[in-house]
């Protein structure tokens, strides 16, 4: 399956925080979305192969890495002034 952690996270002002996303489905593609209250999902970043990733629609204030196929961590940087949201990770073949 696919595992995202933590379930809840509090960020101190000026801090970077990292959300973990791990999958054991042998999927090449992985995605990070953000959902704000009353809104649809918006794509932050996506990765289609190891060590490559592209910006989605709202990449400002976020960073990612894809060091291995199974993992696609998202860092919410201190530059992201409005980080409060629901974050969703997904993967596909």
């Amino acid at each position: 399956g696919i595992t995202q952690s933590p379930k809840y996270l509090f960020r101190k002002e000026g801090q970077n925080v990292t959300l973990s996303c791990e999958q054991n489905l042998n999927h090449d593609a992985m995605y990070w979305y953000r959902q704000d209250p009353g809104q649809g999902l918006r794509l932050i970043y996506y990765s289609q192969i190891v060590n490559d990733f592209q910006k989605g629609d709202i990449a400002e204030g976020y960073s990612v890495s894809r060091e291995k196929k199974e993992s696609f961590p998202l860092t919410v940087t201190s530059a992201q002034k409005n980080p409060t949201a629901f974050y969703l990770c997904a993967s596909s073949i």
Partner: antibody, heavy 120, light 112 residues
């Protein structure tokens, strides 16, 4: 910052096996990425030889497939090249290398290179 | 294997000149993901190659803005807008779309 350093004999006899080791510092080779061997012939041409992945899987240049083995020693954070049945045509500068984060497979971490001469 | 053909093989130019090096691949370098894994390296004597441009047009960290890359499919160019003394070196294109990864034969840029 990832740093790579090749080591091994500079002279190998024809028909013998060339063995080189790359020691990686600043990053664990099991944490991610692909750990490559690339050689440069005296005429300056570059050839990708193959890699070992973070999970231990290999991908080799088919032109070398019957002669090449890339392995690793995770306890020492090293990966190694063995090339069997060498000839004078295998004389080259051998580099270990790994990709820079987020660039696809574009390599930007290189060892200093080690010159291997095949001669009796 | 994908053949990478660079032209010219050597080039003489002066400081301040605009220089273009071309690279042609024997097959399309568009990956199944839609990305194109064509890269440019600079090499100086006795040193390992250094990454300049990755994925056709992305300048690597610390690379001056006078270096730019363009192209698509099978035809690619590296342009140096205004040559500086430290730019005299050998330049290689490389593809990592298809295994085995391959390099061009190099373009040696010399001082006129």
């Amino acid at each position: 910052q990832v740093q790579l350093q090749e080591s091994g004999p500079g002279l190998v006899k024809p028909s013998e096996t060339l063995s080189l080791t790359c020691t990686v510092s600043g990053y664990s080779i099991t944490s991610g990425y692909f750990w490559n061997w690339i050689r440069q012939f005296p005429g300056k041409g570059l050839e990708w030889m193959g890699y070992i992945s973070y999970d231990g899987s290999n991908n080799y240049n088919p032109s070398l497939k019957s002669r090449i083995t890339i392995s690793r020693d995770t306890s020492k954070n090293q990966f190694s090249l063995k090339l069997s049945s060498v000839t004078a045509a295998d004389t080259a500068v051998y580099y270990c290398a790994s990709p820079s984060p987020g660039t696809g497979y574009a390599v930007d971490y290189w060892g200093q290179g080690t010159t291997v001469t095949v001669s009796s | 294997d994908i053949q990478m053909t660079q032209s010219p093989s050597s080039l003489s130019a002066s400081v301040g000149d605009r220089v273009t090096i071309t690279c042609r691949s024997s097959q399309s370098l568009v990956h199944s993901t839609g990305n194109t894994y064509l890269h440019w390296y600079q090499q100086k004597p006795g040193k390992a190659p250094k990454l300049l441009i990755y994925k056709v047009s992305n300048r690597f960290s610390g690379v001056p803005s006078r270096f730019s890359g363009s192209g698509s499919g099978t035809d690619f160019t590296l342009t140096i807008s205004s040559l500086q003394p430290e730019d005299f070196a050998t330049y290689y294109c490389s593809q990592s779309t298809h295994v085995p990864f391959t390099f061009g034969q190099g373009t040696k840029l010399e001082i006129k």
